[in-house]
Amino acid sequence: KEITNALETWGALGQDINLDIPSFQMSDDIDDIKWEKTSDKKKIAQFRKEKETFKEKDTYKLFKNGTLKIKHLKTDDQDIYKVSIYDTKGKNVLEKIFDLKIQERVSKPKISWTCINTTLTCEVMNGTDPELNLYQDGKHLKLSQRVITHKWTTSLSAKFKCTAGNKVSKESSVEPVSCPEKGLD
């Protein structure tokens, strides 16, 4: 089934995430809160009134307000999750779909340069779908994915900033670059 009403949620590999149920408040009428991982149609956590809370494994934690915590996210946690909330008569009073997408956090970008041909490189080694941005003295120069190579001509000294980011993280590096007049390393 194509999910049109899913809440897109981003999590960082190795980190924890809370899937919070929007506009839901626990009440005495609530009899059952059930979380399912829909790829294998499997129940992963469940609260039932006057019953022990069920969790399929220890990486899941279900809070009293219905929030599901997934600990130490792994790539196979990327999935579509469904939470269904039922009253004492079995009525489905609230249902939400979460499209959980997982990314590796970006590493700090590395800036290197050579004065011989006034070329600067910014590179990010780790991270899912990183976006690199290069700035010279506060002015945006280039946008790329993993590597930016830039040849500068305006002046031999400049402050370069390189930022790497994705949906779950952001890192930056700043380097004041100064080259001698004759363009020697």
Epitope: T38, N92, E95
Partner: antibody, heavy 117, light 107 residues
Amino acid sequence: EVQLEESGGGLVMPGGSLKLSCAASGFAFSSYDMSWVRQTPEKRLEWVAYISGGGFTYYPDTVKGRFTLSRDNAKNTLYLQMSSLKSEDTAMYYCARQGANWELVYWGQGTTLTVSS
Amino acid sequence: DIVMTQSPATLSVTPGDRVFLSCRASQSISDFLHWYQQKSHESPRLLIKYASQSISGIPSRFSGSGSGSDFTLSINSVEPEDVGVYLCQNGHNFPPTFGGGTKLEIK
């Protein structure tokens, strides 16, 4: 009083298609999860399809890709579109209203599907 | 899928008898076990949910017990109208699966 009435069954050739309907009354249809369950000629009960109150569907592997379950909350009606039918699909098809954990609280009277050449 | 096994396949009893119907799951399903009664030419009817919870309108002679993988449906004092097939169903995960049934006959 909760009522569920199935219709649309009949005799179909293998490879053919058919659409079953289930008219619901006596309850807030849009707020309940619904399912189709079938009973084979050998009297075995098998789950066919599930749809949540919000329209999310699950199918067992036996019918996945061939059957499509949908609901029209304005008409209080559940639909089961079946295609690429096989002789193994021959059964009595029941529409049912379920609770939180797959308990089938109310059942219709059923409609018969026969797949045969 | 979870396999549900019911025994015996057929049970022949005398009115007034106390009977026990067994249902076993191929893995633990906690108390997510539901019982149904199906009379000849009728739709199944929910008797017991969550292994032991009674259902409104069902006579009190029907009761359920068990947890994990072994479950029992008890009929305290069988009446002639209790003839039919009794089915158990796993309610833990999808697809919910049914047992093959126990046919209750009156001698």
